[in-house]
């Protein structure tokens, strides 16, 4: 069964900078990746970026740079302009769409214990419930 992993990390040098890494583990070629925060897109979450393997990327503030890392993984750099750091308690969700297999999505957040600059381990949280 395909899976999606989500990893959120805080940059060591800039505590206001975060990076979300997402990857797809499974067969099929990825047609589209949607990244959102505050929950899944369509379920109260806000879209941050949409990445297409051929047509490029679209991103919305506070997303700074969305890019493909491999054919099945992406990264999204975020700039937190606020004094406090709301990203630290935020859920980030990634949805990978593969044709004709379908879509898989997962959410993750910065682990509370993680030190700045240390890469948080992948924390996949498969979305199985409709009321998230």
């Amino acid at each position: 069964t395909p899976e999606v992993w989500v990893q959120v990390q805080m940059e060591a040098t800039e505590l206001s900078s975060f990076t979300v890494h997402c990857g797809f583990l499974g067969p099929g070629s990825i047609s589209l990746v949607t990244v959102s925060w505050g929950g899944p897109d369509g379920a109260g979450g806000t879209k941050l970026a949409v990445l297409h393997p051929e047509l490029g990327t679209r991103q919305w503030a506070p997303a700074r740079q969305a890019r493909w890392e491999t054919q099945s993984s992406i990264s999204l750099a975020l700039e937190d302009s606020g004094a406090s750091s709301p990203f630290a308690n935020t859920t980030f969700c990634c949805k990978f769409a593969s044709f004709p297999e379908g879509s898989w999505e997962s959410c993750g957040s910065l682990p509370p214990s993680s030190d700045p600059g240390l890469s948080a381990p992948p924390t996949p949280v498969p979305i199985l419930r409709a009321d998230l």
Epitope: G28, S29, S31, L32, P40, D41, G42, A43, V50, H52, E54, L55, K95, A97, S98, F99, P100, E101, G102, S103, E105, I127, L128, R129, A130
Partner: antibody, heavy 120, light 107 residues
């Protein structure tokens, strides 16, 4: 303007074969996923076969696996559905459709359909 | 495969009425739901994608909502030209599946 025009339907004997074609125009055919959808006499819609824009990944409805083959000819902007060992339950109106990545794979354009009747 | 249960099967309404069609998925399909309109003698036409996004040229009297398993399609102020069969469809997991359709008739 995006256009999809199907042809090749007709009356065929039980166990016979038929090849449906769909000529696409108004868009870059090679960049889109395509599919064949049929509408049964009861007006139910079923996705019969689909092909990724990479022409590698395909999908077939369980009941047509091993009997139907979806393919495309990029040079001729044409989608095909080769149907063999036809059964009475294959009687339907067959549509070709384009899938849009940015619309969650919704089928944003459909052809006018071609009718297939399998008789005993 | 995911079953899309669409209700009602038939709707008889007057022009100007508000119409609601529901679609229930047998498991979560996220927001990967589309709605199509099929007028008599025509092929289906895309109306809504990602539940609530209107396709190009679709009037704003058509709206959609829902997430997960429960979806609603609404026509505010039905017009005579809305006479058609409406289908929901999920594209979350292969095989893509359609609802059974709702036939809208105008009094």
């Amino acid at each position: 303007d995006v256009q999809l025009v199907e042809s090749g339907g007709g009356l065929v004997k039980l166990g016979g074969s038929l090849k449906l074609s769909c000529v696409a125009s108004g868009f870059t055919f090679s960049s889109y996923h395509m599919s064949w959808i049929r509408q049964t006499p009861e007006k139910r819609l079923e996705l019969v076969a689909a092909i990724n824009s990479n022409d590698i990944n395909t999908y077939y409805l369980d009941t047509v696996k091993g009997r139907f083959t979806i393919s495309r000819d990029i040079a001729k902007n044409t989608l095909h559905l080769q149907m063999s060992s036809l059964k009475s339950e294959d009687t339907a109106l067959y549509y070709c459709a384009r899938h849009e990545d940015y619309y969650g794979f919704a089928m944003d354009y459909w052809g006018q359909g071609t009718s297939v009747t399998v008789s005993s | 495969s995911i079953v899309m249960t669409q209700t009602p099967k038939f709707l008889l309404v007057s022009a100007g009425d508000r119409v609601t069609i529901t679609c229930k998925a047998s498991q979560s399909v996220s927001n990967d739901v589309a709605w199509y309109q099929q007028k008599p003698g025509q092929s289906p036409k895309l109306l809504m994608y990602y539940v609530s996004n209107r396709f190009t040229g679709v009037p704003d009297r058509f709206t959609g909502s829902g997430y997960g398993t429960d979806f609603t399609f609404t026509i505010n102020t039905v017009q005579a030209e809305d006479l058609a069969v409406y289908f929901c469809q999920q594209a979350y997991r292969s095989p893509w599946t359609f609802g059974g359709g709702t036939k809208l008739e105008i009094k």
